[in-house]
Interface confidence: low
């Protein structure tokens, strides 16, 4: 808190300019009019104020706008945004994507701070859904943004927004998130031809069910092992050796290196050893010849 003192003669700020960097904190408090500051916020960013001086400027704006800053001020906060607390930001009503971009730019290159998380939350809630332009902006600044959302939050993402998602945006998503995103991606890309469709859908396949994987195996897609290893185990288990061979194409040889890891390990245990031997990869652990395989899940469904 800065003490209230009279402004020294001749020091009253007529405009926000670089001469203010030499004002002591109490002089800034006494000599800079809050309304002038609010109308010339765009200049603050071009002036090398210290963090202590920025504290004083923030204090002045807080006094002028106790209910929260108007968007005209927020858009030009620049580095003063780093001084805001999540509590400050919860008072704001940010509706313009340009404002959001301007503030994200300030935090660029840093981890998502609580301030930024609060800002994004306020913005998205204000819009009602994660539209394509917003998602485009957020993933450009924070590639991991999508995977930081809960499955419930992801359910508000319209399929049209999926076009903005890049493979790296999904790197940290878990299966529950991909379960939500995959059907949206399938819908978004449904009118593309086979090879183009696979390129787009590939990153989302961690949420694909068995029947979709079977369908893909008929389309010569040559899925790489990295993608295969991210598939849902329960979706892979019912695939036959022939289907996996078709799905992976020339990459099928990579199964040997992954035979101890899920989902490959669990899939091997479900296959007849005879069938595995047809791959010529030396995969071991399949069901020995002559053993009868009972599908208990089918039996339960019938009884």
């Amino acid at each position: 808190e800065v003490e209230k003192t009279a402004c020294p003669s001749g020091k009253k700020a007529r405009e926000i300019d670089e001469s203010l960097i030499f004002y002591k904190k109490w002089e800034l408090e006494a000599c800079v009019d809050a309304a002038l500051l609010a109308t010339q916020m765009d200049r603050v960013n071009a002036i090398p104020f210290t963090y202590e001086q920025l504290d004083v400027l923030k204090h002045k704006l807080d006094e002028l706008y106790p209910q929260g800053y108007p968007e005209s001020v927020i858009q030009h906060l620049g580095y003063l945004f780093l001084k805001m607390s999540p509590e400050d930001i919860r008072k704001w009503n940010v509706t313009s994507l340009e404002t959001l971009k301007a503030l994200l730019e300030v935090n660029k290159g840093h981890e998502m701070s609580p301030q930024v998380a609060t800002l994004i939350d306020r913005f998205v809630k204000g819009r009602g859904q994660l539209d394509k332009d917003t998602l485009d902006t957020l993933t450009a600044f924070y590639p991991g943004y999508l995977c930081s959302l809960s499955p419930e939050e992801l359910s508000s993402v319209p399929p049209s927004s999926i076009w903005a998602v890049r493979p790296q945006d999904l790197d940290t998503c878990d299966p529950r998130q991909l379960d939500v995103l995959y059907p949206k991606a399938r819908l978004a890309f449904q009118n593309m031809n086979g090879s183009e469709y696979f390129v787009k859908i590939q990153s989302f396949l961690g949420g694909a069910p068995t029947e979709d994987l079977k369908a893909l195996s008929q389309q010569n897609v040559s899925m790489d092992l990295a993608t295969f290893m991210k598939l849902r185990t329960d979706a892979v288990l019912p695939l036959t050796v022939a289907e996996v061979q078709k799905l992976l194409g020339p990459h099928v040889e990579g199964l040997k290196a992954e035979e101890r890891h899920r989902p490959v390990r669990d899939w091997i245990l479900r296959q007849r050893q005879d069938d595995l031997d047809t791959l010529g990869l030396g995969l071991q652990g399949g069901i020995p010849n002559g053993y009868l395989v009972l599908d208990l899940s089918m039996q339960e469904a019938l009884s």
Epitope: E18, S19, P48, F49
Partner: nanobody, 124 residues
Framework: EVQLVESGGGLVQPGGSLRLSCAAS????????MGWFRQAPGKGRELVAG????????YYPDSVEGRFTISRDNAKRMVYLQMNSLRAEDTAVYYC?????????????????WGQGTQVTVSS
Amino acid sequence: EVQLVESGGGLVQPGGSLRLSCAASGDTLSTYAMGWFRQAPGKGRELVAGITSSGSGTYYPDSVEGRFTISRDNAKRMVYLQMNSLRAEDTAVYYCAARRIGPVYDPYSVYNYWGQGTQVTVSS
């Protein structure tokens, strides 16, 4: 980035004058606010004069107000510190420093670029 080299220091009697110069190379000087600091033995650095990038605003602490004058010539890429009525307590190494116009990331080092310093000794 800007490189700074100070000159003009030396031995002067109390009451005497000295003019320090700071030559800048690298970036355009007009994009930097400039300051003169001093550091006496066993003490921290203190800002004794500051000037805005255009030269329109200056700052002096009470200890040198009226005795020291900072000026700049952006075309010649020079900054000057005219020191009059020198006292024994003005003895120190004097540094020229620059701070970029734009946001300050680090609250502890407002000035980004420093010269090597020039010794000023006031003694009879």
